[in-house]
């Protein structure tokens, strides 16, 4: 309706005596600005006045005067839009119809708001969900229809008369559409809050009680379930008898179904809250407890674990670990069903009672070969001593023992001899399945264990072999001894240190690297021609005539070597020198006549002097002194002398004749 | 203060049904569970059952499940229990009861006669 | 439900005894949220409603003399009341509130 002034605040306030009321409110007035603003208590309309009566409890004026008694009442709205209200404090009295009388220039208008005060706190409002089921969160709420910001309030939750735990969300409300305070608890059930009392408290901000609402939580539960079992201890003898009662503590909604599981498996046609076992048998040892479920689900009890007591039944040996390495720790353990479990044990290895072993497990820390074989056990307890059972084998393994190189020759071996050897051991476990040699070369192995060298090497000294399964054992290396030819013969200069010059005294050394065996013999050679047996050869005084090619032989009983040729070489200065005359000594004038220097000399000579009759030298140097034409008063006696690295040597005269042509005869 | 009032003594014939009543005053209703008790002459205490008047939910003991219904009403803040099918050993008296965290309160007791 | 046993059935005394009478539960009543025991003690003479005494297995209710008292925790429960007067002639009962409601046979008290 357009003629209408609009209005926005909450219908009905509610409040408590001595409490305030913030009354939230907004308008929109039909023209022009509020002139005028009168709160009225309960008015009522004076059709003879046309004017509203009532108590007047706020009054504002054009003049903007307000008496000192309305200070209780606070308009703390404006001209046009606010018309909210405040009292505080809040009496009984105040209960009722609030009237806001407004006046713009030419409209006025009568809105009336409902104030619900009462003589002592009331109380909030518990909110819970249609159904709780315990370990599902659920919130519940706690919400009073109050707020007022002048007049703080909390509300606090409890349990039992015990402040909850959970931390609870408070919010307000203070507007045009409602106001209320309102706390939300978020918290997970569980059975046992079945029944119990959950309390919003309403208190002043010193935490003052002021009213409170409760509830009793109605939790859906699963049954929970207690067992009972007789024997308590649920320790029973074959042939005994047991029973089991379940007893139900709690159960939201009502239980419908019973039943009874061993091990996780229902049993058939047990669905009472008895279970009777008549004559138990060690079969129906286990884990029992018994299930009962309502619209929930089901619950079930704890488990209580039968023993059914007997006597041990026949062992079994178990081994960890075989086969076993020799060395390693093995570890027997007896495996016997019995309760109570064995007391005593009695261990047998290949028949034979152990001594001194009477626990569960055998360690033995160091595992030998002649630990294999089989062991078995007894167990004993109270009620009885179990059967012996078959047992269980032992296999020791280890590396082939006592390897050893077996050389198949006769001896002694021969460089170039084909040898055989086999590799030997004294046991295995498990097989050897192959044999190693060292050192490694192209040699034959003609079968399993065994070795042929063929032509055998004078320096094959040692070898020796592996025998191998999982690991591989090695023998002591054996020597071969080949017997050989001394080796490596040659001639060695032992003095003097430089070139051999005539006249020196000389060493020459036969040596040899090796020989096998170790006995040997030397002989010196020159030109065929056996010179000592001595492993030197000596020369007092060398001279030129024992130059030449030398070797030595080495022999032992093997065979013989010789060195290379050696060729000895000595250094002297020109000798047997001579002067030789070519066509002859008696030369016609006008000829040429070659005179030679003949010499024997180490190195060869490197400078010729030539010298005449007078022993004047002449101006030649070479070998050889050519004169050409010759003449007659080339006649006379010449000698030479040959220059080389050690020495000078002469020779003795020579004498050229040279005679008149028959020309120069007939020009005379 | 709290009281919980409930119905004078009833005669009944075997075979037939009962009502006790059970008005509470002196706290919200809707609030707490309203239990029943029996006692038959000369025995102790047992259980019924409770009701929960806040949404009308039940529990039983297993003994009475067939015997006993309990109810509410919110509107004049009073429980019920109607016990059906009456046999001599239900003579006893039946009272109603509630908790609080920190006490109970119980009403005077209601003696149910079954005889022919 | 949890079972309750209580004994003696009855007991004779003399004014001025120590009287104890015990109350077994077949599962703990203890209340973890709170740490309480739910578990009252009631007094009951002929024709009466039953009267508390004691609740949270150990807590005086208001107004009762304090010869009476309660002790235990979890199953095991014990009421005792310290100088047997003429008026404690009833019988009395335990009752426990942890999950639905179960009460005990209870002991008759006479005096000699």
């Known amino acids: 309706d357009s003629s209408k002034w609009v209005f926005e605040h909450p219908e009905t306030l509610y409040a408590w005596e001595g409490a305030c009321v913030w009354i939230p409110c907004t308008y929109r007035a039909l023209d022009g600005d509020l002139e005028s603003f009168i709160l009225f208590h309960n008015p009522e309309y004076n059709k003879n006045t046309s004017k509203f009566d009532g108590t007047r409890l706020y009054e504002s004026t054009k003049d903007g005067k307000v008496p000192s008694e309305q200070k209780r009442v606070q308009f703390l709205g404006d001209k046009n839009k606010n018309c909210t209200l405040s009292i505080h404090p809040v009496h009984l009295n105040d209960s009722g119809q609030l009237g806001l009388r407004m006046e713009s220039k030419t409209e006025k208008w009568m809105e009336r708001i409902h104030l619900n005060v009462s003589e002592r706190p009331f109380p909030p409002h518990i909110q819970l969900p249609p159904e709780i089921q315990e370990s599902q969160e659920v919130t519940l709420t706690c919400l009073l229809n109050f707020s007022c910001y002048g007049y703080p309030i909390q509300l606090q939750w409890l349990l039992e008369g015990v402040p909850m735990r959970q931390a609870a969300v408070t919010s307000t409300s203070l507007t045009i559409k409602s106001v209320f305070t309102r706390s939300e608890l978020k918290f997970s059930p569980q059975w046992s809050h079945h029944g119990k009392i959950v309390t919003c408290q309403l208190q002043d901000a010193d935490g003052k009680f002021l009213s409170n609402d409760t509830v009793q939580l109605n939790v859906k539960h699963t049954p929970k379930l207690e067992i009972k079992v007789t024997p308590s201890d649920a320790i029973v003898r074959e042939g005994d008898s047991v029973t089991m009662t379940c007893e139900v503590s709690s159960s939201n909604p009502e239980y419908t179904t019973v039943s009874w599981l061993k091990d996780g498996t229902s049993l058939k046609k047990q669905n009472t809250f008895t279970l009777n076992l008549r004559e138990v048998t060690k079969d129906q040892s286990g884990k029992y407890c018994c299930q009962v479920s309502n619209d929930v689900g089901p619950g079930r009890s704890e488990e209580v674990f039968l023993q059914v007591q007997y006597a041990p039944e026949p062992s079994t040996v178990q081994i960890l670990h075989s086969p076993a390495v020799e060395g390693s720790q093995v570890e027997f353990l007896c495996m016997s069903l019995a309760n109570p479990l064995p007391t005593n044990y009695t261990w047998y290895h290949n028949g034979k009672e152990m001594q001194g072993r009477t626990e569960e497990k055998v360690h033995i820390p160091k595992i030998l070969p002649w630990h294999a074989g089989t062991y078995s056990c007894v167990a004993e307890n109270i009620l009885g001593t179990g059967q012996r059972g078959p047992g269980a084998e032992l296999d020791v393994q280890y590396p082939p023992k006592k390897v050893t190189t077996v050389i198949q020759n006769p001896m002694p071996i021969r460089e170039g001899d084909t040898v055989t050897l086999s590799c030997n051991y004294n046991s295995s476990n498990p097989s050897v399945t192959r044999y190693e040699w060292k050192p490694h070369g192209a040699w034959e192995e003609p079968s399993l264990g065994v070795l042929k060298i063929q032509n055998v090497g004078w320096d094959n000294t040692t070898i020796a072999c592996a025998a191998c399964n999982s690991w591989c054992s090695w023998a002591s290396p054996v020597a071969l001894n080949v017997q050989y030819a001394p080796r490596d013969v040659r001639v060695r200069k032992i003095k003097p240190l430089s070139e051999i010059h005539s006249g020196n005294s000389v060493s020459l050394q036969c040596d040899f690297s090796s020989s096998h065996p170790k006995e040997v013999q030397f002989f010196w050679e020159k030109n065929g021609r056996l010179l000592g047996k001595e492993s030197q050869l000596n020369f007092d005084s060398i001279s030129p005539e024992d130059a030449g090619s030398y070797s030595c032989w080495v022999n032992n009983s093997i065979g013989q070597t010789a060195s290379k040729a050696w060729t000895l070489e000595v250094l002297y200065a020109p000798r047997r020198l001579r002067v030789s005359m070519s066509p002859g000594d008696q030369v016609m004038e006008g000829k040429s006549a070659t005179l030679t220097c003949e010499s024997d000399a180490n190195p060869p000579v490197s400078h010729y002097t030539w010298f005449d009759w007078n022993n004047q030298s002449l101006p030649y140097h070479s070998q050889k002194l050519r004169l050409e034409p010759v003449k007659v008063q080339h006649s006379g006696a010449y000698w030479c002398q040959g220059t080389n690295s050690v020495g000078k040597g002469r020779s003795p005269l020579s004498t050229l004749t040279v005679y008149y042509s028959p020309e120069t005869i007939g020009r005379r | 203060q709290v009281q919980l009032v409930q119905s004078g003594a009833e005669v009944k014939k075997p075979g037939a049904s009962v009502k006790v009543s059970c008005k509470a005053s002196g706290y919200t209703f809707t609030s707490y569970w309203l239990h029943w008790v029996r006692q038959a002459p000369g025995q102790g205490l047992e259980w019924i059952g409770y009701i929960n008047p806040r949404n009308d939910y039940t529990e039983y003991n297993q003994n009475f499940k067939d015997k006993a219904t309990l109810t509410a009403d919110k509107s004049t803040s009073t429980a019920y229990m109607e016990l059906s099918s009456l046999r001599s050993e239900d003579t006893a008296v039946y009272y109603c009861a509630r908790r609080d965290i920190t006490t109970f309160y119980w009403g005077q007791g209601t003696t149910v006669t079954v005889s022919s | 439900d949890i079972q309750m046993t209580q004994s003696p059935s009855s007991l004779s005394a003399s004014v001025g005894d120590r009287v104890t009478m015990s109350c077994k539960s077949s599962?703990?009543?203890?209340?973890?949220?709170?740490?309480?025991?739910?578990l009252a003690w009631y007094q009951q003479k002929p024709g009466k409603a039953p009267k508390l005494l004691i609740y949270w297995a150990s807590t005086r209710e208001s107004g009762v003399p304090s010869r009476f008292s309660g002790s235990g925790s979890g199953t095991d429960f014990t009421f005792t009341i310290s100088s047997l007067q003429p008026e404690d002639i009833a019988t009395y009962y335990c009752?426990?509130?942890?999950?639905?409601?179960?009460f005990g046979g209870g002991t008759k008290v006479e005096i000699k």
């Open positions: 599962q703990s009543v203890l209340y973890s949220a709170n740490h309480k025991n739910y």
């Open positions: 009752h426990q509130y942890l999950s639905s409601w179960t």
